[in-house]
Interface confidence: low
Amino acid sequence: LSLEAPTVGKGQAPGIEETDGELTAAPTPEQPERGVHFVTTAPTLKLLNHHPLLEEFLQEGLEKGDEELRPALPFQPDPPAPFTPSPLPRLANQDSRPVFTSPTPAMAAVPTQPQSKEGPWSPESESPMLRITAPLPPGPSMAVPTLGPGEIASTTPPSRAWTPTQEGPGDMGRPWVAEVVSQGAGIGIQGTITSSTASGDDEETTTTTTIITTTITTVQTPGPCSWNFSGPEGSLDSPTDLSSPTDVGLDCFFYISVYPGYGVEIKVQNISLREGETVTVEGLGGPDPLPLANQSFLLRGQVIRSPTHQAALRFQSLPPPAGPGTFHFHYQAYLLSCHFPRRPAYGDVTVTSLHPGGSARFHCATGYQLKGARHLTCLNATQPFWDSKEPVCIAACGGVIRNATTGRIVSPGFPGNYSNNLTCHWLLEAPEGQRLHLHFEKVSLAEDDDRLIIRNGDNVEAPPVYDSYEVEYLPIEGLLSSGKHFFVELSTDSSGAAAGMALRYEAFQQGHCYEPFVKYGNFSSSTPTYPVGTTVEFSCDPGYTLEQGSIIIECVDPHDPQWNETEPACRAV
């Protein structure tokens, strides 16, 4: 007869006995692990689809020690997932204007390598300007041409137009560079081109390493303007001095992609739009675009958080002479987190961090055993996830409880019904030199062949001190062991079921009385260890009144210490 409960205990090899502890697959776009939510911060507004900032989850980055929880080199070495900006339906609060479409520029600007995160490029007075202040890797959705040594950018389209491509990850062998794709705009760019490569239709590859200052003016034809951002942070500024045909307004797109495992946070630094202009923000990278905000909600100081690693901002302006409004947004990547793990019923969970690398450790109340992994780790992914299923605390069918000081044993399924055809054995063992008191919290057995036996000893042959077959009423004063063991047997037959049993135990020293217990009440004691001579006074919680037994009891009889009266019970008024 094996009395050991089938659980992982200390001293046993972890990762071997655990059940249901297998890795779960990272959530996929087709089968998201849970609903995607996003969050905004001040000013506090009741916004459609907006949740208040969850301080515990999202402010952890401010706490000491959190840096160590970030994945090493969070923006290297893998490139962000390819953009697929076309089509992007269902923008929030859209009128009849066309939805996002894939930009098809006549020409792309030269990639540049910024000098620092702070924005190294200075506007040039002679040309219209878009300020880009982020250190960015190339977004894979645009093929980027590179000038050969000594070449000057043409003011007319080259014979081969550079159009959006979806050919997989960009060339991450080069440093991060900005991609600027514009149509109907002149853009001045100053910076360093470093080891950039581009391949054309004829498989010719050009590589240059040179420093240039250039002004690129593209053909003035109606159409969208579009920019890709792929660094950990950057600024999004409204296009300024963009010359357009008189009958066409601007339709500009800003695509942001950060490293998987991070979300995009966009802060409104300044915004001043003209009537009729729109700015819309969506989260991308999930199964569907996620509307985040539109101009109605984009107030100065507002923070929009996309829970995905890609976001898109669309700006639609009025045609001249009204001219476009202006805005200045700042975006940055923020570390996404695992969801807070469910606290198991009849147990507890301790979380060190919800960010990747953080852990959750689970414990069960006495009488329950953990099924599953005791320790989960938050893994980095596009949507971070726990490396195992959340465990549950189950009432075990038997087990050995050594060093039993105080606690309880419950039947499997408690407080729900037990199963049929059970045979459960529990062995309770008090610390050396102590005895046990067993208190009946609840016993509810089906009126057939289900049976509870409690034996005064450590095995199935020990003499019974309680047998549900023999006794109609529970001994309200409980049971005392003569030695340090109780052996509890619960057996159920093939029919009928009930709640089963919950037994509370406590150990007490020789020469002492056991610790009293009263449900829905309290007691005060003249001494903490209950030697002979101790008096205990009981009281009930509000709404309950004392019944049966005595309000004050005393530990008597030095030879066989025991309470002189039964513990009272507190009943609801």
Epitope: G11, P14, D348, T350, T352, P356, R361
Partner: antibody, heavy 114, light 106 residues
Framework: QVQLQQPGSVLVRPGDSVKLSCKAS????????MHWVKQSPGQGLEWIGE????????NYNEKFKGKATLTVDTSSSTAYVDLSSLTSEDSAVYYC???????WGQGTTLTVSS | ENVLTQSPAIMSASPGEKVTMTCSAS?????MYWYQQKSSTSPKLWIY???KLTSGVPGRFSGSGSGNSYSLTISNMEAEDVATYYC?????????FGSGTKLEIK
Amino acid sequence: QVQLQQPGSVLVRPGDSVKLSCKASGYTFTSYWMHWVKQSPGQGLEWIGEIHPHSGSTNYNEKFKGKATLTVDTSSSTAYVDLSSLTSEDSAVYYCVGGHYDYWGQGTTLTVSS
Amino acid sequence: ENVLTQSPAIMSASPGEKVTMTCSASSSVNYMYWYQQKSSTSPKLWIYDTSKLTSGVPGRFSGSGSGNSYSLTISNMEAEDVATYYCFQGSGYPLTFGSGTKLEIK
């Protein structure tokens, strides 16, 4: 059964660096944090930091940042601590601790002496 | 940093005597761990989750406490219990150990 094997002792000169190893067996190496603990002669125990082999995530005791670097090689189920710019203050026994704080290596005695 | 203060630093007990050592945490912890270390050997996890004994630990040992205050008790001291006992918390970073209680036999 669970075993964490560490070299018995290492002697290095001041200013040098050293990489101590800890080879794990008998449990799922990638499922549990691996901790490193320092015990100076006649002193108590100090937690250096932890690394999770599956994700490579690390947490360090502020006191050991810049001194210790934790790495793992999952293919060989081995954890490492790299100690740099060694001084006599770094002479100690270094333990690796696996599982849920359960399993300790026998410790590596590091002596820094010229 | 959560500082764990153990007391007493050194204590001696006679065989059969009851021994109690305490560990006080500067910040509340969820669970306390206790290690036993004998001279020239690695520490061994002795008690985990405040009161659970590691497999093979004699029943005369017990652990209790909550919040900021925890204790390890030996109901009747035996010669083999001579060792240094360290408390340890894993509830917050950095993880910390107590300075240890050295238990000797009279």
